[in-house]
């Protein structure tokens, strides 16, 4: 059962796993949620009645019954982890804590103009977990404006104390705001020879990489496959770090794989969700329960629904025993990973999908693409919306993309002459315009946010956000697309598609069925040559065939230029402008979304 509210002046008795320090009860709840075993917590707020050494302690707890006896205690705040909840969870914490010194290992001390600059520095530093900034009112003149970047083994402070005129906060890496490079490559036959901070068992290098990503100290990893010569090290995932943040030595070794933490791309690829099944593989761990199940998929469901289950092993039924049901072993461990992995025993193993909600919804795999043809099929582009105006009569105005459960990203030029959001309707999950009738449900628009530097499409900043009046419930036919990572600026996208209900030629009409076209990206240099009368800036991106023939056109504006990278779709561009439609040597010009990620996040995450 999901309990989100906090219990004031209440302490949970017993069940202690560990104690960490957090600046607030709210953040204690987040830490509990991300901890592999924590189900409940008790936080101690600052209070004259409480010993100051106990202020800001966050005691993480576990219980077989999922609850613990409650005791009244002033200044104690207790609650439950969000593991029991079905809603989306994020570790992003933008709060700035005034008059708190969050202690850790200070590894960088420098002058910064503001707390915001200090936080940005922390976000863009590979080692930084949190920071403390001495404001310009700080009593010690020489320490004013000093920004201390800090890290710890756990990612949380080792202690928190009151200190006037300082502010503290966390890195915003988990808010997708880091400019650090996102290196997704896994290097075969490679061992990174740097210091190990931890080791866990993993079934493959991908799971190892995902574990590294959400381990606070891990910057890169080495995984020994099941063919690794040393038996005791098979399936071992070594989590590593170095002072420089990069591996100092790479050793060529067969049957080993290495890679990097995906911390700076974690909003656009799954890092918590281990959805694969591992055949002929047994995961060992503490046994929680043994249940009969029809299949390994059913076993995974049982594990996902049991809040304490972290992973499972399913042994298929022997012949016609037990009505064809096999045994489903639900398991857990102290760190969420198997204690040992065995092969050749016939088991099928996997992980709980409970943690998938900690990943961005946009990373969920969608239906396989229909190759060829120009008409889309239902569910092929679930982020695509049709934006209608009701004035003077109802018609399709522009395309747009779902990027959050209350947010549509589109083009600013769509709103020329639109006086009020009241005349707008957003339809999602639509394939054919003819589906839209009087009684078709739609989302009203609460607010239109146009980039304040927008003047006209050709001069850039052609980007706008629509805040919906109600939230979108994600389904197979309506779900968000990932924004590109700022760390992905150098990625060369090769699988890009433009979609919309726009004209198929310059003098045409809005199409009934959602059209799609695969279009190659064009370099900005090449694009500039084709548009000598315009300035093609780095905030624009171009796509099109040299010979023309495929392009976005009138009515597609505001819609997505969607590119698939590492099995995840990213919103690389917003259809903006071009000379004619699909003309030879006249590529389409799109708003380069990666350059506006900060703006998007600033507007959509504003309190």
């Amino acid at each position: 059962e999901c309990v989100t509210q906090l219990l004031k002046d209440t302490c949970f008795e017993g069940g202690d796993i560990t104690t960490v320090f957090t600046p607030s009860a709210k953040y204690c709840q987040v830490v509990c949620t991300y901890h592999p075993r924590c189900l409940l917590f008790t936080f101690t707020a600052e209070s004259p009645s409480e010993d100051p050494t106990r202020w800001f302690t966050c005691v993480l707890k576990d219980s077989v019954t999922e609850t613990l006896p409650r005791v009244n205690r002033t200044a104690a705040i207790s609650g439950y982890s969000f593991k029991q909840c079905s809603h989306q969870i994020s570790a992003c914490n933008k709060d700035i804590y005034v008059d708190l010194d969050m202690k850790g290992i200070n590894y960088n001390s420098s002058v910064a103009k503001s707390a915001q600059e200090c936080q940005e520095r922390c976000t863009d530093d590979v080692h930084c977990h949190f920071f403390t900034y001495a404001t310009r009112q700080f009593p010690s003149l020489e320490h004013r404006n000093i920004c201390l970047l800090k890290h710890t083994q756990t990612g949380t402070p080792t202690r928190i104390t009151k200190l006037d005129k300082v502010v503290s906060g966390f890195s915003l890496k988990s808010c997708a705001l880091s400019n650090l490079a996102c290196i997704r490559d896994i290097f075969p036959n490679t061992v990174f020879a740097d210091s190990n901070i931890d080791s866990v068992m993993a079934p493959d290098a991908f799971v190892c990489g995902r574990i590294c990503t959400h381990h606070p100290g891990c910057l890169f990893f080495t995984f020994f496959s099941q063919e690794w010569p040393k038996e005791s090290q098979r399936n071992l995932c070594l989590l590593k770090t170095s002072e420089s943040g990069l591996p100092s030595t790479r050793i060529k070794k067969s049957k080993a794989l290495s890679g990097f933490s995906l911390q700076s791309c974690r909003h656009s690829i799954p890092v918590f969700c281990h959805s694969s099944f591992y055949h002929d593989t047994d995961f060992l761990g503490e046994e929680l329960d043994i249940v009969a199940a029809k299949s390994h998929e059913a076993c995974q469901k049982l594990c996902t629904n049991a809040v304490r289950c972290q992973f499972f092993t399913y042994t298929p039924a022997q012949a016609s025993c037990n009505e064809g049901k096999g045994k489903c072993y639900l398991k857990l461990s102290s760190n969420g990973s198997p204690t040992k992995i065995l092969h050749g025993r016939g088991g099928i193993s996997g992980y709980t999908l409970r943690l998938c909600k900690m990943d961005n919804e946009c990373t969920t795999k969608i239906k396989p693409r229909i190759v060829g043809g120009t008409a889309s099929v239902r569910g092929e582009w679930p982020w695509q919306v049709t934006l209608h105006t009701t004035s003077p009569t109802q018609r399709h105005l522009c395309g747009g993309s779902i990027i959050g459960n209350q947010w549509i990203l589109t083009a600013a030029h769509c709103f020329y002459g639109v006086e009020s959001p009241k005349i707008l309707r957003v339809y999602s999950g639509i394939l054919n315009q003819s589906e839209i009738k009087e009684d078709t449900s739609f989302f009203g628009v609460q607010e239109i946010i146009i980039h304040d530097q927008y003047k006209m499409a050709e001069s850039g900043y052609d980007i706008a956000l629509l805040k919906l009046e109600t939230t979108v419930n994600y389904t197979d036919s309506q779900r968000p697309i990932c924004l590109p990572s700022k760390g992905d600026r150098n990625v060369i996208y090769t699988d890009c598609w433009v979609t919309g209900w726009g004209y198929r030629k310059l003098r045409d009409k809005i199409q009934n069925t959602l059209q799609k076209a695969k279009i190659p990206l064009v370099t900005n240099e090449e694009c500039q040559k084709r548009y000598r009368g315009h300035k093609i800036t780095h905030k624009m991106i171009c796509a099109g065939y040299r010979e023309g023939g495929k392009d976005a056109c009138k009515g597609d504006s505001g819609g997505p230029l969607s590119c698939k990278h590492n099995e995840v779709w990213h919103l690389v561009g917003i259809t903006s402008w071009g000379e004619g439609c699909a003309q030879r040597e006249r590529p389409g010009v799109y708003t380069n979304v990666v350059e506006y990620v900060d703006w998007i996040l600033e507007k959509t995450q504003a309190v």
Partner: antibody
Framework: QVQLEESGPGLVAPSQSLSITCTVS????????IYWVRQPPGKGLEWLGM???????DYNSALKSRLSISKDNSKSQVFLKMNSLQTDDTARYYC??????????WGQGTTLTVSS | DIVMTQSHKFMSTSVGDRVSITCKAS??????VAWYQQKPGQSPKLLIY???YRNTGVPDRFTGSGSGTDFTFTISSVQAEDLAVYYC?????????FGGGTKLERL
């Protein structure tokens, strides 16, 4: 855990130079300032100077011309150099870690005697 | 440069007494004053920083107060192990400077 250890020559002749090393462990020199403080026998504490995490330095005005503080972050070492030593430079020399201008951890100190 | 003056070189006290040591700055140092304890043959130990903040592990019988130019360090109930020399230090502006020290001795 946090430790600071000073090492010096012990005895130096007048007019000679002094070089003392402070070797730290348990923290990074890029994240903390390090101070030098001395204490003549039977007397009080005298602040000599400091080097900040980012490498900036500050010195005691009266000793500025004779003092130089530097560091090697990779070796976790801070160096105090002082020239033209006189007998009144005889003291116990301490290095200490900065905590917002106060000194939260101190070394045990190294004794320097200036004598011919 | 800022000069810190501890008017009493010596102070006599008995176990259980409340004792206050004062320190005066030659100019305004806001609340950037620290207090240290030094026992014979040992390094100084930080007790109080920024006038009133106790360092980790320091017993709550030690307190500090003041602002501007006048500062006070108080031991609410002196224990035998508190007999030592106490120094104030301004950490408002470099060059930082110490007071001359106050020796707390048995009456």
């Amino acid at each position: 855990q946090v430790q600071l250890e000073e090492s010096g020559p012990g005895l130096v002749a007048p007019s000679q130079s002094l070089s003392i090393t402070c070797t730290v462990s348990g923290f990074s020199l890029t994240g903390y300032g390090i101070y030098w403080v001395r204490q003549p026998p039977g007397k009080g504490l005298e602040w000599l100077g400091m080097i900040w995490g980012d490498g900036r330095t500050d010195y005691n005005s009266a000793l500025k011309s004779r003092l130089s503080i530097s560091k090697d972050n990779s070796k976790s070492q801070v160096f105090l150099k002082m020239n033209s030593l006189q007998t009144d430079d005889t003291a116990r020399y301490y290095c200490a870690r900065d905590y917002y201008g106060s000194k939260d951890y101190w070394g045990q100190g190294t004794t320097l005697t200036v004598s011919s | 440069d800022i000069v810190m003056t501890q008017s009493h070189k010596f102070m006599s006290t008995s176990v259980g007494d409340r004792v206050s040591i004062t320190c005066k700055a030659s100019q305004d140092v806001s609340t950037a004053v620290a207090w240290y304890q030094q026992k014979p043959g040992q390094s100084p130990k930080l007790l109080i920083y920024l006038t009133s903040y106790r360092n980790t592990g320091v017993p709550d019988r030690f307190t500090g107060s003041g602002s501007g130019t006048d500062f006070t360090f108080t031991i609410s109930s002196v224990q035998a192990e508190d007999l030592a020399v106490y120094y104030c230090q301004q950490h408002y502006k470099t060059p930082y400077s110490f007071g001359g020290g106050t020796k707390l001795e048995r009456l």
